[in-house]
């Protein structure tokens, strides 16, 4: 089938990095500057992606492959092929349309991206709070209160000033 196709369509012989030039008797011509063809038999070359402004070049365009972009530091990629750049926030914050905002009490975010999530509710697993949660860190659940009867454990949990096990409603 490939041989038959080659006989019928001279363009099928044009390799990646070239295009089948109808203006020149279907001769295989190299892709012009700032364009590429990633497969053989192409009748046109695609324009290279330009990484500018908030985007920076991760991989230069070549005659056979498109440029690849990532985001300038302070922002991170979103979408297939880094189609968008989104602002980083600090740990303990989440991104809103108003910019980076601190996590509400009872929630945390330990990354520079993503949303604030509720602290673990230790009591749902029958456990107690060993370490209080913060905006940047989840609570640490310890043994269940029953396990902490005298002599059962050498761990003495601090008495928290507040019970941070759930997000405020």
């Amino acid at each position: 089938f490939e041989r038959t196709r080659s006989l019928q369509d001279p363009c099928s012989n044009c390799p990646a990095g070239t295009f089948c030039d109808n203006n020149r008797n279907q001769i295989c011509s190299p892709c012009p500057p700032n364009s590429f063809s990633s497969a053989g038999g192409q009748r046109t070359c695609d324009i290279c992606r330009q990484c500018k402004g908030v985007f920076r070049t991760r991989k230069e365009c070549s005659s056979t492959s498109n440029a690849e972009c990532d985001c300038t530091p302070g922002f991170h990629c979103l979408g297939a092929g880094c189609s968008m750049c989104e602002q980083d926030c600090k740990q303990g914050q989440e991104l809103t349309k108003k910019g980076c905002k601190d996590c509400c009490f009872g929630t945390f975010n330990d990354q520079k991206r993503g949303i604030c999530r509720p602290w673990t509710n230790c009591s749902l697993d029958g456990k107690s709070v060993l370490v209080n949660g913060t905006k940047e860190r989840d609570v640490v659940c310890g043994p269940s209160p029953a396990d902490l009867s005298p002599g059962a454990s050498s761990v003495t949990p601090p008495a928290p000033a507040r019970e941070p096990g759930h997000s405020p409603q």
Epitope: V54, G79, M84, C85, E86, Q87, K97
Partner: nanobody, 123 residues
Framework: EVQLVESGGGLVQPGGSLRLSCAAS?????NYWMIWVRQAPGKELEW???????????YYVDSVQGRFTISRDNAKNSLYLQMNSLRAEDTAVYYC????????????????SGQGTTVTVSS
């Protein structure tokens, strides 16, 4: 082709003012949130302000709140940043960028930006 072209940068003394413009083409400007960001020498890119499609919502980073004003003219496909009471720390390359057609809780990214215009604040 979607294009954003910034202009209006230059050298200004501390306390002075500048108005940056961003000319948009190749897309329906009025359908998108628009954003200003900047990059100071040796610093990370910083989000400054954004504005919704009709200009009724505007938000600013704390460091420019009360000094900078973002605005848009959809009839002219243009975005603006009025910068007053400029300080040395405002020295940076300023970029305008296109945000989403609709902001959601899942992302507040930008998919296109210009080449930038340089603002230098110095006496």
């Amino acid at each position: 082709e979607v294009q954003l072209v910034e202009s209006g940068g230059g050298l200004v003394q501390p306390g002075g003012s500048l108005r940056l413009s961003c000319a948009a083409s190749g897309f329906t400007f009025g359908n998108y949130w628009m954003i200003w960001v900047r990059q100071a020498p040796g610093k990370e890119l910083e989000w400054l302000a954004n504005i919704n499609q009709n200009g009724s919502e505007r938000y600013y980073v704390d460091s420019v709140q009360g000094r900078f004003t973002i605005s848009r003219d959809n009839a002219k496909n243009s975005l603006y940043l009025q910068m007053n009471s400029l300080r040395a720390e405002d020295t940076a390359v300023y970029y305008c960028a296109r945000g989403g057609a609709d902001y959601s809780n899942s992302h507040y990214g930008m998919d296109v930006s210009g080449q930038g215009t340089t603002v230098t604040v110095s006496s």
